[in-house]
C-alpha cells in the first residue's frame, strides 16, 4: 500500500512553553514545531489532536509524512504549506477531522512531491475550484497528487451556501485538468445525489473510486468507458434501483474492474431483467450473491441471482380514463 506509516520511531516532542521563544527566531532547519512530535528517521511529523488553528510555520524541511488531524484549522489559505526552502519531500498530508470549512485556491501549492492528500471528515462548505490546481488557467500544471481522500466532507445542510455540493467538489476535481494522474479517489459518505456526467472522463488514470454511502439513485448519465485502469468501484450503501444496459456494458468492458454493489434498494420489476441476466454471467461484481430486492414489497429480500424473467414484471399502467381516484 502507498499510505504513509504512522508508526514512526524515535519521536521528539516539542515543549509548548518554547513556542513563543522559537517563533521569534528564524526557524532552524530540523526543529520540531510546538505541539508536534517529529521523527527525522521516519521523516514524519505528527501534530494530532492539538486544537491547532493554523498550520505550523516551522515545519522541518525533511518532512515526508505530515499528520495534522484532529485540529481546528477552519481555513486553509493559499500557500498554506509554502515555505522557504519549500517542503520538497512532503508526500503524504493528512488533514482529516480538523474542522476545515474553507480550502482556498492554491492551498497546496509549492508541494512538488505531494502524492497523497486526506481531507476527510471536514465540513467543507467552501472548497475553491482551484484548491488542487492552484490556478484558474484552463489547463494547469499537472498536480503531483495520486491519492485524494475526500470522505465525509459534506457540510451541514444550512452551511451549503445554496449551491450544489456535488458541483463544488467536481469543479475542484476538474479545474485545469490538473488531476489527470489521480489513481485513488475516495468520495464516500457525502450525500451525493448524482455524479456529474463529465467527472470520470477527465480522470483517466483512476484505479480506485469509492462512492460508497452516498445517495446515488442512478448511473444512467455516468460514463465509465475511458477508465481503462479502474480496478475497484465502490457503490455500496447508495440508493441505486437498477443498472441499465449501457452501464452494464461499459463496466463489463473494463478489463480489471471489480464493482461493489451491496446494500442498495434494488427494484425488482421488469426493468431489472437485463441486470439480473448480466449478474448471472459476470465476474465483475464482488459478492453478487448477497444482492437482494428491496421493492416491490412482494419481492423484498429475494436474491437477485435467483430471479428469472417470470419474477420480474411491471404493474400495467392504466390509461387515465380507467384510473380511479
Amino acid at each position: 500500500s502507498s499510505s504513509p506509516t504512522s508508526s514512526a520511531s524515535s519521536f521528539s516532542s516539542s515543549a509548548p512553553f518554547l513556542a513563543s521563544a522559537v517563533s521569534a527566531q528564524p526557524p532552524l532547519p530540523d526543529q520540531c514545531p510546538a505541539l508536534c512530535e517529529c521523527s527525522e528517521a521516519a521523516r514524519t511529523v505528527k501534530c494530532v489532536n492539538r486544537n491547532l488553528t493554523e498550520v505550523p510555520t516551522d515545519l522541518p524541511a525533511y518532512v515526508r509524512n505530515l499528520f495534522l488531524t484532529g485540529n481546528q484549522l477552519a481555513v486553509l489559505p493559499a500557500g498554506a504549506f509554502a515555505r522557504r526552502p519549500p517542503l520538497a519531500e512532503l508526500a503524504a498530508l493528512n488533514l482529516s477531522g480538523s474542522r476545515l470549512d474553507e480550502v482556498r485556491a492554491g492551498a497546496f501549492e509549492h508541494l512538488p512531491s505531494l502524492r497523497q492528500l486526506d481531507l476527510s471528515h471536514n465540513p467543507l462548505a467552501d472548497l475553491s475550484p482551484f484548491a488542487f490546481s492552484g490556478s484558474n488557467a484552463s489547463v494547469s500544471a499537472p498536480s503531483p497528487l495520486v491519492e485524494l481522500i475526500l470522505n465525509h466532507i459534506v457540510p451541514p445542510e444550512d452551511e451549503r451556501q445554496n449551491r450544489s455540493f456535488e458541483g463544488m467538489v467536481v469543479a475542484a476535481l476538474l479545474a485545469g485538468r490538473a488531476l489527470q494522474g489521480l489513481r485513488r479517489l475516495e468520495l464516500a459518505s457525502n450525500h451525493f445525489l448524482y455524479l456529474p456526467r463529465d467527472v470520470l472522463a477527465q480522470l483517466p488514470s483512476l484505479r480506485h473510486l469509492d462512492l460508497s454511502n452516498n445517495s446515488l439513485v442512478s448511473l444512467t448519465y455516468v460514463s465509465f468507458r475511458n477508465l481503462t485502469h479502474l480496478e475497484s468501484l465502490h457503490l455500496e450503501d447508495n440508493a441505486l434501483k437498477v443498472l441499465h444496459n449501457g452501464t452494464l456494458a461499459e463496466l463489463q468492458g473494463l478489463p480489471h474492474i471489480r464493482v461493489f454493489l451491496d446494500n442498495n434498494p434494488w427494484v425488482c420489476d421488469c426493468h431489472m431483467a437485463d441486470m439480473v441476466t448480466w449478474l448471472k454471467e459476470t465476474e465483475v461484481v464482488q459478492g453478487k450473491d448477497r444482492l437482494t430486492c428491496a421493492y416491490p414489497e412482494k419481492m423484498r429480500n429475494r436474491v437477485l441471482l435467483e430471479l428469472n424473467s417470470a419474477d420480474l414484471d411491471c404493474d400495467p399502467i392504466l390509461p387515465p380514463s380507467l384510473q380511479t381516484s
Epitope: 500500500s1 502507498s2 480506485h208 485502469h229 480496478e231
Partner: antibody, heavy 118, light 113 residues
C-alpha cells in the same frame, strides 16, 4: 506477518513441465496484482508474467504460450505453470506483489530454483 | 521489445562517495513516472528502494534519491555506506492497447574500491 513463500522448483528435463506455487500470508491475494520475476544464475532480473486483480494476465513475449500464471483465491496462492522447458529457463523464480496504487513490486518472496538439464 | 539500459554496468566507489546510476528506457514508462529502483544483495530477494521515479519506499534511508521522467532516470546515493554495496536494478512499467508490460534494466553492480 506479510510474506510470500515460493515452492515447486526442482530439476526437470528439457521439454518437461513444472508448476510453481507462491503462498501468501498476512494479506488477501485477491486484492492485489501478483507477478513472477526470474533470475538466471549470475544474471539480472527478468520479468515473466503478471495477473491483475480480476484475473487478466500479461506475459513477457518469450513466455507467451509456454507459461501460464493463475491463482486460487481460496488458497491464497499464486501459480506458474511452465511447459516445454528449456535450459535457458534455469533460474531462481520469485513471486512479487504489486502495489495497489503504483505499478511497482513492493513485496518479494525468497525464490524457488528451477533447473532444466538433461 | 522494450529495453531498459543501465549505466554503468559496474562501478567501484568508497564509503562516503556520491554515486549516480542512470537508466534509459527505449519507450516512455507509463504516466512518465512508473519507474522503480531495487537493491539486491547476493542470495537475497530484491528490495524496493524508490517507486514512481522519485518516491522513497518505506524504511529506505534518505541518502537514496531518484529523479527523471519519461525515458531517462537517475538513482543517486548521496553518501555511500558500507551496507550499500550491492546490485541495483531499475524497472519500468508500460501500458499499450494490448495490455501491461514490465521490464528490468540489466543491473549495476556497486563494489568497494
Amino acid at each position: 506477518e506479510v510474506q510470500l513463500l515460493e515452492s515447486g522448483g526442482s530439476l526437470v528435463l528439457p521439454g518437461g513441465s513444472l508448476r510453481l506455487s507462491c503462498a501468501a500470508s498476512g494479506f488477501s491475494l485477491s486484492s492485489y496484482w501478483m507477478s513472477w520475476v526470474r533470475q538466471a544464475p549470475g544474471k539480472g532480473l527478468e520479468w515473466v508474467s503478471i495477473i491483475a486483480g480480476r484475473g487478466s494476465t500479461y506475459y513477457a513475449s518469450w513466455a507467451k504460450g509456454r507459461f501460464t500464471i493463475s491463482r486460487d483465491n481460496s488458497k491464497n496462492t499464486l501459480y506458474m505453470q511452465m511447459n516445454s522447458l528449456r535450459a535457458e529457463d534455469t533460474a531462481l523464480y520469485f513471486c512479487a506483489r504489486v502495489s495497489s496504487i503504483y505499478y511497482t513490486f513492493n513485496l518479494w518472496g525468497q525464490g524457488t530454483l528451477v533447473t532444466v538439464s538433461s | 521489445e522494450i529495453v531498459l539500459t543501465q549505466s554503468p554496468s559496474s562501478l567501484s566507489a568508497s564509503v562516503g562517495d556520491r554515486v549516480t546510476i542512470t537508466c534509459q528506457s527505449s519507450q516512455s514508462v507509463y504516466s512518465n513516472n512508473e519507474l522503480s529502483w531495487y537493491q539486491q544483495k547476493p542470495g537475497k530477494a530484491p528490495k524496493l528502494l524508490i517507486y514512481y521515479a522519485s518516491t522513497l519506499a518505506s524504511g529506505v534511508p534518505s541518502r537514496f534519491s531518484g529523479s527523471g521522467s519519461g525515458t531517462d532516470f537517475t538513482l543517486t546515493i548521496s553518501s555511500l555506506q558500507p551496507e550499500d554495496f550491492a546490485t541495483y536494478y531499475c524497472q519500468g512499467s508500460y501500458y499499450s492497447g494490448s495490455g501491461w508490460y514490465y521490464a528490468f534494466g540489466q543491473g549495476t553492480k556497486l563494489e568497494i574500491k
